[in-house]
């Protein structure tokens, strides 16, 4: 009886371990799978996400194409509308000019005493930059680089007057602290009678033949 | 710390060109402008000419207009005058100089200068 | 262009004494001068710039003053590195100018 039990148990035991083992091997092809599975979905996920930056990519691409080739036209139409007209004023900024809010905006890369800035912007029948708000302010210092850049103001005469006859004193003033100064230490014959932007924005005054950068503002026809 | 290093002279015949260069190292050389100085033999410092920090203002001294070419490489920290046409007066030890500022500072570190001689 | 008359040519001087050297500008330039020192066979060396502002790691013993045309370089008390040639240079506007030169020499 014994010995009869103990085959059975003996046979129950490898059964057992059989089908451990194959059970095992199942786990481990399922799990195998579910791992292929998850890579499989991954990959899907990055090549998914990868398409949508291109698109998006090429979306932005198509967008600043088209913004350009309105600009471009708008700018095309301006010129020969300048073309037909007596040139008297601007319909429209020239080549290489900025606009904002009306005006026509010319940033120098090199360097001239504050007269020969404005002969130059005279030239170009316009005039040294007159700042007229916070605003325009902002623009300007956005765009003009951390450089000294004289602007359309002198107390060459006397009082702050600005070059376009814009009243200095009800206007907008941006002096650094203890500014203008109007140093007569100079030995020219007068103080430092020409203001500029100084590499923060800030205005200073400072001697007239020192070689900064300079802006030339332009009224646009406000008509088109 | 703060270096030029100026090289490229050398002897060279009259009408001849020749490319002096500057490597700075030592200070964020793209916020810079950046000048040449020249000293002939015996004599004292002439200013030769000026590049402001984004190379976009370039002015020479009346002696070298026409002939001589400054130029900045702010990618490789590199200050060049190219001398064209060269004359028998060009002869001098030539310093690179940093701006204080832009371009219209003063200067406030030198180089220790290359020489260059224009003889036949 | 701006011409630069520096005075004297050359000087000689002991060791502690005060010594003055003068420039001259053809027209004002407010205070856009600065003062160089060389010595032979060496490169020039920035002393002062904004005609009276020192450069950093120059001593105290340097000093400028001036404004307009009429500039001065003093040092207080001559040491023997100081035995050198002086420069002034504008830089109010381009051309940028030097004056000729000052030897400060051994009395």
């Known amino acids: 009886q014994n010995s009869k039990l103990r085959g059975e148990l003996q046979a129950l035991r490898e059964t057992f371990s059989n089908f451990t083992a194959s059970t095992e091997v199942e786990v481990k092809a399922l799990s195998s799978q579910g791992g292929n599975v998850g890579r499989k979905m991954k990959s899907l996920e990055s090549q998914l996400e990868k398409q949508q930056k291109d698109l998006s990519e090429d979306h932005s691409d198509l967008l600043l194409h088209v913004k350009q080739f309105v600009s471009d036209l708008r700018s095309l139409s301006c010129q020969i509308a300048a073309l037909h007209g007596n040139g008297s004023t601007l319909t429209c900024c020239p080549v290489n000019w900025l606009e904002y809010e009306g005006s026509c905006y010319w940033f120098s890369r090199s360097g001239k005493s504050w007269p020969e800035a404005d002969k130059y912007c005279q030239l170009e029948s316009a005039h040294l930059v007159v700042v007229n708000s916070r605003e325009e302010q902002k623009f300007i210092q956005h765009h003009m680089g951390p450089v000294n850049t004289w602007m359309g103001l002198t107390d060459q005469s006397g009082p702050w007057k600005w070059v376009d006859g814009t009243d200095y004193e009800t206007g907008f003033k941006n002096w650094r602290p203890e500014q203008p100064d109007d140093w007569y230490g100079h030995g020219l014959g007068g103080g430092e009678d020409c203001a500029h932007f100084t590499d923060d924005g800030r205005w200073n005054d400072d001697v007239c033949q020192r070689p900064y950068r300079w802006v030339c503002e332009a009224a646009r026809d406000p008509a088109t | 710390q703060v270096q030029l290093v100026e090289s490229g002279g050398g002897v060279v015949q009259p009408g001849r060109s020749l490319k002096l260069s500057c490597a700075a190292s030592?200070?964020?050389?793209?916020?810079?402008?950046m000048h040449w100085v020249r000293q002939a033999p015996g004599k004292g410092l002439e200013w030769v000419a000026v590049?402001?920090?984004?190379?976009?203002?370039?002015n020479y001294a009346d002696s070298v207009k026409g002939r001589f070419t400054i130029s900045r490489d702010n990618s490789k920290n590199t200050l060049c005058l190219q001398m064209n046409s060269l004359r028998a007066e060009d002869t001098a030890v030539y310093y690179c100089?940093?701006?204080?500022?832009?371009?219209?500072?003063?200067?406030?570190?030198w180089g220790q200068g290359t020489t260059v001689t224009v003889s036949s | 262009d701006i011409q630069m008359a520096q005075s004297p040519s050359s000087l000689s001087a002991s060791v502690g004494d005060r010594v003055t050297i003068t420039c001259r500008t053809s027209?004002?330039?407010?205070?856009?001068l600065a003062w160089f020192q060389q010595k032979p066979g060496k490169a020039p060396k920035s002393l002062l710039y904004?005609?009276?502002s020192l450069q950093g790691g120059v001593p105290s013993k340097f000093s400028g003053s001036g404004s307009g045309t009429d500039f001065t370089l003093t040092i207080s008390s001559l040491q023997p590195e100081d035995f050198a040639t002086y420069y002034c240079?504008?830089?109010?506007?381009?051309?940028?100018?030097f004056g000729g030169g000052t030897k400060v020499e051994i009395k």
């Open positions: 100089a940093r701006d204080q500022g832009v371009g219209y500072d003063g200067l406030d570190v």
């Open positions: 030592g200070f964020t050389f793209s916020t810079y402008g």
């Open positions: 590049i402001w920090y984004d190379g976009t203002n370039k």
């Open positions: 027209q004002g330039i407010g205070k856009y």
């Open positions: 904004k005609a009276s």
């Open positions: 240079q504008q830089y109010m506007t381009y051309p940028l100018t």
